[in-house]
């Protein structure tokens, strides 16, 4: 366990031309505050992905009013450090996002308005217990100067805060096999409490007898690098020999979310959905009021002025969560039908419909039979996102408006001649054939093949096809 500490030194215009306008004015005085978000590893995740190592808000800075005509100076900053406590081992490599927020103090409807002024991000290596590291980051025309460090909380020590220290039992030296705890020379490394054989580099423990692995290591003693190759069986072969990950306790087992938060598993870890009034990785931060600026991404805070009354964040379109901390992938719900494509325009969703479809969700088939008449006795048949007319004899075309030549398809078999007729077509059959389409041969004995000729109709007579 330990604390990541961030000290903001200055925030103001960067060097070079194109100095930014002051964010505050005589009409709109404002003050700054900062938010830091930490993630383990050298991730390049989007700004809205969870701050898995933790997040913190600064206090508000002094109220600032721009002096007319004066260039934007370094802006007055909040007092104190931003502190992000971490419960587990310090990962050594981490990503950070530092946001500079402006709180406008003019006559805002519904209280102060917040807007994001600048966001910087980076990926760094840092050993716990080391000196302050200084950094300069630029965001557009703004420049942010800051220092940071990670320090272990007693009794933890070491570059990952995984070794434990205890006060000396004897005044002069540590017990057998135990070293002094630099830099706390009056303390000794605690007797080994982890499981016997637990890797000192890749494992750590918080309870006696356990061995928990740092990212990238597995096995009962954290001595096996995690293999990226697939395992041979659903659970994989023996994890102790191959490094395949064996499903163990889920990250939500035992519910790590405090204060009534609900836990959901993510591909890498877990995510807590916190009740109002609480936030942080494990919903551990409480007593929050609107004065703390708990609503991210431009959310509007409404509610209590004292820690006991809950606040409500009214999130802008595209964000959700009790603190507006989660970006909503509204299109992932597949709202558009019939092949329409979903566009998230921020303020609204829109379905871009394919030809032939309309409606907010492309649910209306413009080519369906509703209100579509097929002419000349044709009947409408729906299918495949389009309509077609099944036309009465003698008519064709999309709407059965065109007169069809019934003989165009050469319907009379065996050399029969086709004649167009007002009610269809007539086949004049060649000798030896009969039937509506001259399809039946006449047998030499005068009997015809099936079907029998209708009464009064001699073989060879023209057959009318009705």
């Amino acid at each position: 366990a330990g604390v990541f500490e961030l000290q903001i030194h200055s925030f103001g215009p960067g060097p070079g031309p194109g100095a930014p306008r002051s964010p505050c004015s005589a009409r709109l005085p404002c003050r700054l505050f900062f938010r830091v978000c930490l993630k383990p590893g050298l991730s390049e995740e989007a700004a809205e992905s969870p701050c898995a190592l933790g997040a913190a808000l600064s206090a508000r800075g002094p109220v600032y009013t721009e002096q007319p005509g004066a260039p934007a100076p370094d802006l007055p900053l909040p007092d104190g450090l931003l502190q992000v406590p971490f419960r587990d081992a310090w990962p050594g490599t981490f990503s950070f996002i530092i946001e500079t927020w402006r709180e406008e103090l003019g006559d805002q409807i519904g209280g102060p308005a917040w807007s994001l002024l600048a966001r910087v991000a980076g990926r760094r290596r840092l050993a716990a217990g080391g000196p302050w590291a200084r950094d300069i980051q630029r965001a557009g025309a703004w420049e942010l100067r800051f220092s940071y460090r990670a320090r272990c909380e007693p009794p933890a020590v070491g570059t990952a805060c995984t070794r434990l220290c205890r006060p000396r039992s004897a005044p002069s030296r540590c017990g057998p096999g135990l070293r002094p705890c630099a830099p706390l020379e009056d303390e000794c490394e605690a007797p080994l409490v982890c499981r016997a054989g637990c890797s000192p580099e890749h494992g750590f423990c918080e309870q006696p007898g356990e061995c928990r692995c740092l990212e990238g290591w597995t096995g009962p003693l954290c001595t096996v690098p995690v293999s990226t190759s697939s395992c041979l069986s659903p659970r994989g072969p023996s994890s102790a020999t191959t490094g395949c990950l064996v499903p163990g306790p889920g990250p939500c087992d035992g519910n790590p979310c405090a204060n009534g938060g609900s836990c959901s598993e993510t591909p890498r870890s877990f995510e807590c959905t916190c009740p109002r009034g609480f936030y942080g990785l494990r919903c551990e931060v409480s007593g929050v009021t609107c004065a703390d600026g708990p609503c991210f991404n431009g959310g509007l805070c409404v509610g209590g002025a004292d820690p006991d009354s809950a606040y409500i964040c009214h999130c802008p379109p595209g964000f959700q969560g009790s603190n507006c901390e989660k970006r909503v992938d509204r299109c992932s719900l597949q709202p558009c039908r019939n092949g329409g494509l979903c566009l998230d325009l921020g303020h609204a969703l829109r379905c871009r419909c394919r030809a032939g479809f309309a409606g907010p969700r492309c649910e209306h088939d413009l080519d369906d039979c509703a209100g579509r008449a097929c002419a000349n006795g044709g009947t409408c048949v729906e299918g495949g996102g389009a309509h077609r007319c099944s036309c009465a004899l003698g008519f064709g075309g999309r709407d059965c408006r065109e007169r069809a030549d019934p003989c165009a398809a050469r319907p009379c078999a065996h050399g029969g001649r086709c004649y167009a007729h007002f009610s269809g077509l007539v086949c004049a059959c060649a000798p030896g054939y009969m039937g509506a389409r001259c399809e039946f041969p006449v047998h030499p004995d005068g009997a015809s093949a099936l079907p029998a000729a209708p009464p009064g109709l001699r073989p060879g007579d023209p057959q009318r096809y009705l």
Epitope: C331, S332, Q334, L343, D344
Partner: antibody
Framework: QVQLQQSGPGLVKPSQTLSLTCAIS??????????WNWIRQSPSRGLEWLGW?????????DYAVSLKSRITINPDTSKNQFSLQLNSLTPEDTAVYYC??????????????WGQGTMVTVSS | QSALTQPPSASGTPGQRVTISCSGS????????INWYQQLPGTAPKLLIY???QRPSGVPDRFSGSKSGTSASLAISGLQSEDEADYYC???????????FGTGTKVTVL
């Protein structure tokens, strides 16, 4: 991460058919949120969208109006790839051909992943 | 013939702010989100801005986009030498039922 690997000939004779393939790794041609495009670029015509295929319960295609009569884009689910066929080629079709993904949820028009490009010359 | 019109070139000194315009019509920019691409010499284009003003992960916040009516613009603040490239706008066109790209703008860092 998502990658697109193009393959196909660099030289095609006039009146023949161009066939290019784009193999997808790290995503699926039957993804419910992505669209898969072919785009070409030439000095005379600049960047030109040719068409796309995408899956939303079933596969759909759309093509640039100017090419509708001679273009086909086909997805191949079994090989996780999609292909371009352009027939009746003329020297005007000489260009660098790119396959791309529109993979940002809610922004299918943003082509976030591009193949390496294939220089296609139409000449006898 | 591209449906979206851009100036052929723009330039600035390091640290300066450069703006590129993109002009279209009601059927494209007027009714659809605009996207911007950067193409460094000899490489495929890269998505720089999507949905008018959204930056994909990894794109520096020196790049910003905006849209008004049937025009859009891309701003590069604090110009750097590595920004020297061709920049293209693009949007869906409802009347053509397809994507249209801009004519392209070559940005030179002096």
């Amino acid at each position: 991460q998502v990658q697109l690997q193009q393959s196909g000939p660099g030289l095609v004779k006039p009146s023949q058919t161009l066939s290019l393939t784009c193999a997808i790794s790290g995503d699926s041609v039957s993804s419910n949120s992505a669209v898969w495009n072919w785009i070409r670029q030439s000095p005379s015509r600049g960047l030109e969208w040719l068409g796309w295929t995408y899956y939303r319960s079933k596969y759909y295609n759309d093509y640039a109006v100017s090419l509708k009569s001679r273009i086909t884009i086909n997805p191949d689910t079994s090989k996780n790839q999609f292909s371009l066929q352009l027939n009746s080629l003329t020297p005007e079709d000489t260009a660098v051909y790119y396959c791309t993904r529109g993979g940002i949820v809610g922004a299918p028009d943003g082509f976030d992943i591009w193949g390496q490009g294939t220089m296609v010359t139409v000449s006898s | 013939q591209s449906a979206l019109t851009q100036p052929p070139s723009a330039s600035g000194t390091p640290g300066q702010r450069v703006t590129i315009s993109c002009s279209g019509s009601n059927s494209n920019i007027g009714s659809n989100p605009i996207n911007w691409y950067q193409q460094l010499p000899g490489t495929a284009p890269k998505l720089l801005i999507y949905s008018n003003n959204q930056r994909p992960s990894g794109v520096p916040d020196r790049f910003s986009g905006s849209k008004s009516g049937t025009s859009a613009s891309l701003a590069i603040s604090g110009l750097q030498s590595e920004d020297e490239a061709d920049y293209y706008c693009a949007a869906w066109d409802d009347s053509l039922n397809g994507h249209v790209f801009g004519t392209g703008t070559k940005v030179t860092v002096l």
